[in-house]
Interface confidence: medium
């Protein structure tokens, strides 16, 4: 279970933490979930690592951040931002968002109470 919630840092502190952690395993894990065995997604070799391994790595990375509503939200927004251009249509965007919303629970963290995933200036 995630460590006890700490003092919520200011947003620049969260940004620094989000920059420091490796969000790639989270992005890969979600892409694996929404793409399944489809082969058209070649930005990563998504079949090289089992999804459960990627999920664990993702959770480990997120666990490095301060355990606050704001920092968790900023990490999820950054994942959305990073993958936005790779999401081919509106349906894929919605699937990605749904999987992203599930991520805190999959990692046994609390979901942020407020977190807007409509980032990237409306592109996603």
């Amino acid at each position: 279970m995630r460590r006890e919630r700490g003092r919520q840092g200011d947003s620049s502190s969260c940004e620094r933490q989000v920059d420091r952690v490796n969000l790639k395993p989270c992005e890969q894990h979600i892409m694996q979930r929404i793409m399944g065995e489809q082969e058209q997604y070649d930005s990563y070799d998504i079949r090289s690592t089992r999804s459960s391994d990627q999920q664990q790595r993702c959770c480990d990375e997120l666990n490095e951040m301060e355990n606050t509503q704001r920092c968790m939200c900023e990490a999820l927004q950054q994942i959305m931002e990073n993958q936005c251009d790779r999401l081919q249509d509106r349906q894929m965007v919605q699937q990605f968002k749904r999987e992203l919303m599930n991520l805190p629970q999959q990692c046994n963290f609390r979901a942020p109470q407020r977190c807007d995933l409509d980032v990237s200036g409306g592109r996603c």
């Epitope: 509503q69 919303m101 629970q105 979901a111 109470q113």
Partner: antibody, heavy 117, light 107 residues
């Protein structure tokens, strides 16, 4: 537009089990990311947050109720439920269901359940 | 559990008045605070979230401020439809906890 509606017996006898169900319309309860919660308000008093159930069945209960409370989810009916065992007059309250996390918290209008013999 | 102390418990005011309600937490909750409006027989409605952000569609006469342990909710220019019960809720820690509520009545 998402709506929540509580339903349960108006009257429960002391020592029995109180059961209340929340029907969700306008959205699937299986969509991840949301906490489906229960809150109650004792007559003339403040609100007590009882706990939540997540779409995968994981629960968190208020420690003050942990020994008596159980929540469940029925995806086929798009409902979630609360059971409270060994009730006393102190459990007389308006019971609200709610959806929390990610965006505006949404509440039902509440249902009054009286514990009396 | 985090204790939320809300005051006053009741308040009489007239249309056009400015009213202020406070909520105090017994430990730091940063800005993880909702302000709700509740009218009997209806679903409670969030007006302010994250202590100071106005919920979509809520009139600008409602405002919130504060962080840490001390929070304030203000209605500037009361309207007839504003007479209701208002309460705060912290969501920084589980279990979430509420203030006791403030009943706003017509003077």
């Amino acid at each position: 537009q998402v709506q929540l509606q509580e339903a349960g017996p108006r009257l429960v006898k002391p020592s029995q089990t109180l059961s209340v169900t929340c029907t969700v319309s306008g959205a699937s309860i299986t969509i991840g990311g949301y906490y489906w919660s229960w809150i109650r308000q004792h007559p003339g008093k403040g609100l007590e947050w009882m706990g939540y159930i997540y779409s995968n069945g994981r629960t968190y209960y208020n420690p003050s109720l942990k020994s008596r409370i159980a929540m469940s989810i029925d995806t086929s009916k798009n409902q979630f439920s609360l059971k409270l065992t060994s009730v006393t007059a102190a459990d007389t309250a308006i019971y609200f269901c709610a959806r929390e996390a990610w965006e505006t918290p949404l509440w039902g209008q509440g249902t009054l359940i009286t514990v009396s013999s | 559990d985090i204790q939320m102390t809300q005051s006053p418990s009741s308040l009489s005011a007239s249309v056009g008045d400015r009213v202020t309600i406070t909520c105090q937490a017994n430990q730091d909750i940063v800005n993880s605070l909702n302000w709700f409006q509740h009218k009997p027989g209806t679903a409670p409605k969030v007006l302010i979230y994250d202590a100071s952000k106005l919920e979509t569609g809520v009139p600008s006469r409602f405002s919130g401020s504060g962080s840490g342990t001390h929070f304030t909710f203000t209605i500037s220019g009361l309207q007839p439809e504003d007479f209701a019960t208002y309460f705060c809720q912290q969501y920084e820690n589980l279990p979430h906890t509420f203030g006791q509520g403030t009943k706003l009545e017509i003077r």
